[in-house]
Interface confidence: low
Amino acid sequence: QRKRRNTIHEFKKSAKTTLIKIDPALKIKTKKVNTADQCANRCTRNKGLPFTCKAFVFDKARKQCLWFPFNSMSSGVKKEFGHEFDLYENKDYIRNCIIGKGRSYKGTVSITKSGIKCQPWSSMIPHEHSFLPSSYRGKDLQENYCRNPRGEEGGPWCFTSNPEVRYEVCDIPQCSEVECMTCNGESYRGLMDHTESGKICQRWDHQTPHRHKFLPERYPDKGFDDNYCRNPDGQPRPWCYTLDPHTRWEYCAIKTCADNTMNDTDVPLETTECIQGQGEGYRGTVNTIWNGIPCQRWDSQYPHEHDMTPENFKCKDLRENYCRNPDGSESPWCFTTDPNIRVGYCSQIPNCDMSHGQDCYRGNGKNYMGNLSQTRSGLTCSMWDKNMEDLHRHIFWEPDASKLNENYCRNPDDDAHGPWCYTGNPLIPWDYCPISRCEGDTTPTIVNLDHPVISCAKTKQLRVVNGIPTRTNIGWMVSLRYRNKHICGGSLIKESWVLTARQCFPSRDLKDYEAWLGIHDVHGRGDEKCKQVLNVSQLVYGPEGSDLVLMKLARPAVLDDFVSTIDLPNYGCTIPEKTSCSVYGWGYTGLINYDGLLRVAHLYIMGNEKCSQHHRGKVTLNESEICAGAEKIGSGPCEGDYGGPLVCEQHKMRMVLGVIVPGRGCAIPNRPGIFVRVAYYAKWIHKIILTYKVPQS
């Protein structure tokens, strides 16, 4: 049997809307059906309808169609809100431009190019003709509207009311002329619904003929209305999936607006000397990455091929080889001129000072008594007296109630990272407040530095699983996947928690991420039996400046021979110099010659003072950093990925002592790597694990 074409893409959908007729003379037809697609097919074909169908409403509750010979622009009709209704209007009747020759144009223009009023199609005065509405069914020869029933060159036309001029074309613009976009069209929300070759776009809320992941409900901010061209994924210009089963997608022909200005809301604040936010507005001339390697020109494809070209990203100022952030990354970056290092962050560019004139605290802020009552993410703090039970759960002394007034930011638990407060949000039980340490304050925040050196290892012996010592396996190693591809490493520190780096999250949509556990090969080859694939349910950002993220898994990992957790060090501990450590990572470069196997590089711990000397004094390390150098001259860059661990062993116990983050690099001879010191953040990690709810297995 012949497959009936799906015509719902020819309609503009208005959710939760119906049409009410004020004029009782207007006809309406109803019928019970299962889907809106069935309503659309009947409306398009006008089958069994005593009128030309211009719109319909699908009543989801009653599973019923209401077909109308009018639309929301008709007189005698008004729009009304209704949860169970979806209004679909035939786009041909509401469009004020033409596609191609305008054969499908059904708008209401009735004046010719030179301004003459059109003659009604049903009239023979002043011009006799054979274009009778009855002879051209479906061509909508209504009233005196411009039409192109035969699809002739020149577009819609009409017989004119001037006896001297038999017919003339009407001046109806091409939709591709009416529609315009700024930059690469990421903010385009126009009504173009066909591709540059004229193929009709597939509705975003449909999965036929092409299955795809861009579901409107999943991406509410991407403007996935009906089947209009959009640019949700940073392409050079808007595109859509097509109704042609053989052409999955195509770009749309949307011209750039004459005055190529962006809405004020889209414009990042332009800066030249420092970075505001993620630096999307940075327009300075820094042209090396953090370690001095020069940037590759954006308009060059050597040594790295890419599509981040000035032509593709018109408003992102991809001039010369300057650091930029065209894609919403963590901060400005560039491709490098080193063939072995594809990209690097320009983390040497300072942040624009946001904190001047604000509150500040000394030490760890335990004596802070200011009246800020908002977290760094903008949540309002909740009253301390409502949260005392929770507070008692993670501190083992009686807090000073006199300090815990109202809902002000405080530090009752001696948190090393400053004042915080509880929130009313069950997903984010508490968070730090946006207060900086007072300028010039050098009070150490690790309160036990005067005590004897604390060992990093807890005193328990190595755990053994099924007789296999876990130190022979790397089951805690996590491959973080972004849109199906490996992006970063991470460490499983608890069944539901992965420790990684904040630079690993280019998108804020958690559905873009997965965690792969139990694998040795980055593509999972040969790891089918042991691999666990888990969704990500939450990201908890570390204290300001930490570059850490705790990633909560949607369900706990199952610990077995292939998946295990790795221990955390004691808070504030010191590991002796020359301790042998390793960094792990898939070292993924995106090159086709990459074998995909997990790599390890052996390093040894180096004191901060010595480390600074090795970096020719260019870097000053603080208490939140740990340094490790390559064991022998000639050993290349460590193979780690961002987010991956620096793992050390003490008293036969393996621990994650560091996290690889961009901007400090890995170890090359005489240039030791600088990692985030996990021991400095151990209390924060424990506090998150203790206070954030996780799903039960």
């Epitope: 795809h212 770009y251 091929e305 599509d307 593509h523 999972g524 040969g526 010659n593 995909g596």
Partner: antibody
Framework: SVEESGGRLVTPGTPLTLTCTVS????????MGWVRQAPGKGLEYIGM?????RAWYATWAKGRFTISKTSPTVDLKITSPTTEDTATYFC????????????????WGQGTLVTVSS | QVLTQTPSPVSAAVGGTVTINCQGS????????FSWYQQKPGQPPKLLIY???TLASGVPSRFKGSGSGTQFTLTISGVQCADAATYYC?????????????FGGGTEVVVK
């Protein structure tokens, strides 16, 4: 559509360039590949050219073939043909990344026959 | 990397079922980076299945792909005369400094 041309009888050692002309395919969006088939034999992958103009080759084909493109054509140069290079050479489009990350040839030309004989 | 197709040739009656196997000498670059093509005499190959089991556009649902790792299968159920052709499997492997694309030797399907 995809159409190959340039196949003919050549003597061993005489360089030969085959041309693949595409229509309705934007070479800045699609990678293209070359595959050959000796008479009565199976298919053999030669190499591909990416959207940015970088060419990749099968291990055995490195140095023996050169792939280049200037829209709307993709060329395959057989640098020094031998009798083993007698085959029908197909040009094929690689399916785009929004469909799959794998190398899949979804649109093929009819092929052009190259005969190498002294 | 070698892809071995079995059996060849294979014959089936109209309406019957044909199963073609393809065995790889090593695991794929990606678990499911595997395709099947159909080629009729004098014609170029035609894509049937990609990603091991995804049906290409316009291909009848009687063609089904399955498998992962090193072992893959193409099943044609309700065989029709038009299915008489040679079928090739294709996998994508890592080798040296390139991703190797390898084709199987082909399996001829004869329809009786």
């Amino acid at each position: 559509s995809v159409e190959e041309s340039g196949g003919r009888l050549v003597t061993p050692g005489t360089p030969l360039t085959l041309t693949c002309t595409v229509s309705g395919i934007d070479l800045s969006n699609y990678a293209m590949g070359w595959v050959r088939q000796a008479p009565g034999k199976g298919l053999e992958y030669i190499g591909m050219i990416g959207v940015n103009g970088r060419a990749w080759y099968a291990t055995w084909a490195k140095g023996r073939f050169t792939i280049s493109k200037t829209s709307p054509t993709v060329d395959l140069k057989i640098t020094s043909p031998t009798t083993e290079d007698t085959a029908t050479y197909f040009c094929a489009r690689l399916i785009d990344e929004r469909s799959t990350y794998s190398y899949v040839f979804d649109l093929w030309g009819q092929g052009t026959l190259v005969t190498v004989s002294s | 990397q070698v892809l071995t197709q079995t059996p060849s040739p294979v014959s089936a009656a109209v309406g019957g079922t044909v199963t073609i196997n393809c065995q790889g000498s090593q695991s794929l670059y990606n678990n499911n980076a595997f395709s099947w093509y159909q080629q009729k005499p004098g014609q170029p190959p035609k894509l049937l299945i990609y990603d091991a089991s995804t049906l290409a556009s316009g291909v009848p649902s009687r063609f089904k792909g399955s498998g992962s790792g090193t072992q893959f299968t193409l099943t044609i159920s309700g065989v029709q005369c038009a299915d008489a052709a040679t079928y090739y499997c294709q996998g994508e492997f890592s080798c040296g400094d390139v991703d190797c694309i390898a084709f199987g030797g082909g399996t001829e399907v004869v329809v009786k």
